[in-house]
Every structure is written in structure tokens, then in C-alpha cells.
Interface confidence: low
Amino acid sequence: STGASSHCQKTSLRVNFEDIGWDSWIIAPKEYDAYECKGGCFFPLADDVTPTKHAIVQTLVHLKFPTKVGKACCVPTKLSPISILYKDDMGVPTLKYHYEGMSVAECGCR
Amino acid sequence: STGASSHCQKTSLRVNFEDIGWDSWIIAPKEYDAYECKGGCFFPLADDVTPTKHAIVQTLVHLKFPTKVGKACCVPTKLSPISILYKDDMGVPTLKYHYEGMSVAECGCR
């Protein structure tokens, strides 16, 4: 998601499963840090936002034609798992050590 | 990059290498379609935008707290190569069949 003036970076985003209705099947944890990718993808794109060639091209086109094309977007480029205790189909509490793709590990410009 | 009211999709983006200053080393083509990912990542995220679990979580948090967190972003999820004729370090025209990551193959919500 895009942010204001700061450059693309990972920021904390505490998520309470009750808020999103997932408490009906996730027993624990009650909340976790999903993190969020915030900030702009400004020219020149720095190495730390690991830009693709397409993101570089789009950034350059945006520089030339800002109304024609948007900047690249700051998004998760690598996700990490969390451990959850959830209710399986039979309602039995089951532990999943690696519930993949739930938390941002790295952000970048795409 | 985000768009107005349409949902996340791939749209044409013609890029002229002269416009971005790459004509100094790319001999051909003069222009190509980089494509662009445009549109919003709205709830519920459809299968065709191949949302990650994190994107789904972020979308749900955005629904509950729209001012606290942004929507997921519509970005390239798969890129494809183009063929280019370029000048190598010695200025010799060289053909590269697969110059990777230059064109959008698929868009998704991340």
C-alpha cells in the first residue's frame, strides 16, 4: 500500500483476529504483527527496495508522464509464516507451526 | 500502482526508450509494451488477483480501519522478457533474446 512522503519500508501493523472475523477458527494467537509496506517508490529507486526492471521502467515513465502512469507500488516482496492454533474441520484444536504468508518479511517497489 | 474504480488488471503501457533515456544503449526495438497493473484491490479479493494471505488480511483490516491501513496494491506478480538489440561495453550491437523482467505477464493484489 502506498504512503505519503517516506520511502518504501516495512512498518508495524498489529492485527487482531477478532477484528477481521478470524477468531471463529483461529484460537491463538489473539493478535499478531502482519506488518505493512508503506511509503513511496521515488526516483531513483534504491537497492534496498529491490526494484525489478519493470519497476525501474515504470518509475522513469512516471517521471516523464506523471499523469499517464503511476509510480511503482511499495508491496511485500517476501512473506514469513506465523504459528497458529486453529480449529480443524472437526473443531479439534490443531497446531500449525508454519502458516505461510501471514507476515511481511521484506518490502520492495513493484 | 493503484487505479480509480476498476479492479486490478493488466493494461497497455507503451514505452518509448527515447522517453526514458535508454535509446543510448538499446538499439531496437524503439518502443515496446511494458504493460501496467492498474485498478483497485477491493473486498472480496477475487481469485484472479491471486491474493496472498497477507493481502487478504490487509484488505480485511482496511475494511475495518480504512484510515489506519491502505488497501493491498495492484502490482505485477509475473514478468516476462523481451528481445533487444543493444550496444555492449565495446559498442558492438548484440542481440539478447531474453532481457528478463521487462513486461508484465500477470497482475495481482499484494
Epitope: A28, S83, L85 | -
Partner: antibody
Amino acid sequence: QVQLLESGGGLVQPGGSLRLSCAASGFTFSSYAMSWVRQAPGKGLEWVSITLGTGHTHYADSVKGRFTISRDNSKNTLYLQMNSLRAEDTAVYYCARGSYIIWSALDYWGQGTLVTVSS
Amino acid sequence: DIQMTQSPSSLSASVGDRVTITCRASQDIRSYLNWYQQKPGKAPKLLIYDASNLQSGVPSRFSGSGSGTDFTLTISSLQPEDFATYYCQQSDTSPLTFGQGTKVEIK
């Protein structure tokens, strides 16, 4: 009220075995994670092992392959089977209840049982 | 494994003093940090769970704060019964790990 009572400690020779027990009362035993934590003389606390309310178990690297944690929910009892004991295993062993079904704060502790490994 | 580092390892204070103990995790443990008090010959006692929640029956002079990697235990006005060793422990993931302890002694 919640009570945890350890037993089974004593003097054992290096290489020997010992089984510790922890009798629990005052709560629904099967719904909580249970841990063993030890403290060598004059040293700090060292977490040893946990059995989650789900039945899953975890061990500290220092005891992996030698110690086995288990629970009998019908008897409200936690066990720690200790094999191939070493001098460095000498410590007071505490049984502790996790405040939840998975890893969490240890909200109730037993009084501890002393294990001495010496020849 | 997540390493927990406490500071200081010991401190001398007087009754009525405000005492602060810090704990640093080697990686992000969110808010899953707990504080224990232990007196000689006794079992540890839970004071604070999940960084800032006061365990039932614990005096309100004890408080905890922090999230991520840096945490603090504060005793607002030290009482005679507070002279003990204090440990932090993370419960974010297994293996659960403790800090090395902070001994609070009478000045």
C-alpha cells in the same frame, strides 16, 4: 486454587535415569501448556521442555534426545523422563503451567524438586 | 533461538526508589514478553505477562512496557519485599527463553 507438586528428584550417577512427576490440581489440566524449567545452583532459569495442550512437545537443545516430556490428562500429571544424565543437569526442576493452550507466560509454578547428578 | 539480554545484571537501590530493568530480544517477539520475580529458595512468580499486563494479585507499583525487541520492567517505589532477582522471558515462540536475571539488592 491451582497447585503443582513435583516429585521424583534425587541423587543419580552420570549416565543414569530419573523420572520426575508433577501432580496438577485446581484447573482443567488438558487445556493448558505445561513446561519444565530448571535452575542450576546459583544460576538463572533455563527452560527445558513444553507439552502443549494439543499434545505437541518441544525441547531445549541441551536436553534434546535425552529427555522426554509427557502428560497423562486422565491423571492430571506431567512427567519428565531424564536419560543419559550429566553433571550439568544438576538443578532444581520446576513444573510450570502456561497461561494458555500454546506457549505463553508461566503463571503457576511448583515448589521444585532437586536433581543431583554426581558419582 | 531467540536470545534475551537483561540489564543491568545487578543493582543496588533503597526503599522508595524507582527501579527500571531492561530486556532486549535478539529478534522481534511482538508483545510476548513476561517478567518474573524470584526470591532465594522459592519458585519464580509471574509479575507481568505480554509486556504490559499485570498478573492478578501483583501490586500496581510493578509495570511493564515495550514491544518488538526492547522491553522495560519498572518498580515505581521499591518496597522491602521487592528485593529479589527478576527475569524476563519470551513466549513468542519455542524454545521459550529467559534473560540471565537482574538481582535487586539493598543499598
